[in-house]
C-alpha cells in the first residue's frame, strides 16, 4: 500500500522574534538587541 501524505514528523515550534532598542542615557547611545524565545542572543 502507498503511504498517505503526512509531514516530516518533526514538530516545528514557532517562536516570536522581538527586536528592541533600549535607551541607556543621552551620552551612551542605545543597546539594540534580538530576543528569541525570551533569551537575548544579539
Amino acid at each position: 500500500d502507498a503511504e498517505f501524505r503526512h509531514d516530516s514528523g518533526y514538530e516545528v515550534h514557532h517562536q516570536k522574534l522581538v527586536f528592541f532598542a533600549e535607551d541607556v542615557g543621552s551620552n551612551k547611545g542605545a543597546i539594540i538587541g534580538l530576543m528569541v524565545g525570551g533569551v537575548v542572543i544579539a
Epitope: E3, R5, H6, D7, G9
Partner: antibody, heavy 123, light 112 residues
Framework: QVTLKESGPGILKPSQTLSLTCSFS??????????VGWIRQPSGKGLEWLAH???????YYNPSLKSQLTISKDTSRNQVFLKITSVDTADTATYYC???????????????WGQGTSVTVSS | DVLMTQTPLSLPVSLGDQASISCRSS???????????LEWYLQKPGQSPKLLIY???TRFSGVPDRFSGSGSGTDFTLKISRVEAEDLGVYYC?????????FGAGTKLELK
Amino acid sequence: QVTLKESGPGILKPSQTLSLTCSFSGFSLSTAGMGVGWIRQPSGKGLEWLAHIWWDDDKYYNPSLKSQLTISKDTSRNQVFLKITSVDTADTATYYCARRGLYYGNYDAMDYWGQGTSVTVSS
Amino acid sequence: DVLMTQTPLSLPVSLGDQASISCRSSQSIVHSNGNTYLEWYLQKPGQSPKLLIYKVSTRFSGVPDRFSGSGSGTDFTLKISRVEAEDLGVYYCFQGSRVPLTFGAGTKLELK
C-alpha cells in the same frame, strides 16, 4: 468556527454520475497544510474513506473506486467536490466531508465533519 | 489494504464502568516519518463521527480525560475510565498511514 456542509442530488438512477459538494467555512484551502476528504456510510453500516484533496491540489483516492472518483476544489468559493461515475445501488449511503490538516497545528486528523448528505441510487 | 479489526463489536456497560475497546491492524501502520496515524472516532445515533483521539494517544481538544488511547505497531486500545451516558454510541478506529485509509467495523457501546 469551522463548519462543513455537504449537498447532493438526494436520489439518482443507476449508471448516472453522482455530484457532491462540500461547502465549508472557518478555514481556507489556500492555507498550506489544509485538506478536505470524503467518507461514506451505507445506512446501518460502517465508514468507508473515498478521497482526499490537499491545498496544493495533491489528491488521494481509494484504489477500489479510483476509476469512478474525481475530487476537485474551488478554493475561492471554499468548496470541494466529489464526482462518482456509473453509480449503482451499492453507492446508496450518507456522504460526509471532513477536514484533515497536514501539519501539527491542524491536528493531522479528521477534526471537523459535516452533517452528511443522504444519497439514494434507485431505478 | 490495511484491515482494522475491532473487538468486541458490541460492549454492554453500566454507567460508571470502565470500558476497553481493542483495534488490531493487519500490518504495521507506522508511517515512514515515525508517527503512527491511529485515530478513534465516536458516532452517536443520527450524528456524524467526532474525533476523540489521534496519533494513538493524543486527545482532541474538548475530549474528557476519561478517554485514553494506547498501543503501538499493530495493537491499539481505547479505554473509557468511567462511562457516562453521553459516551454511548459506535466507536471506530481508523488508520491514516496507508492508502486506502481504513476504518474498523465499529464497536457499539450500549447500556446493559
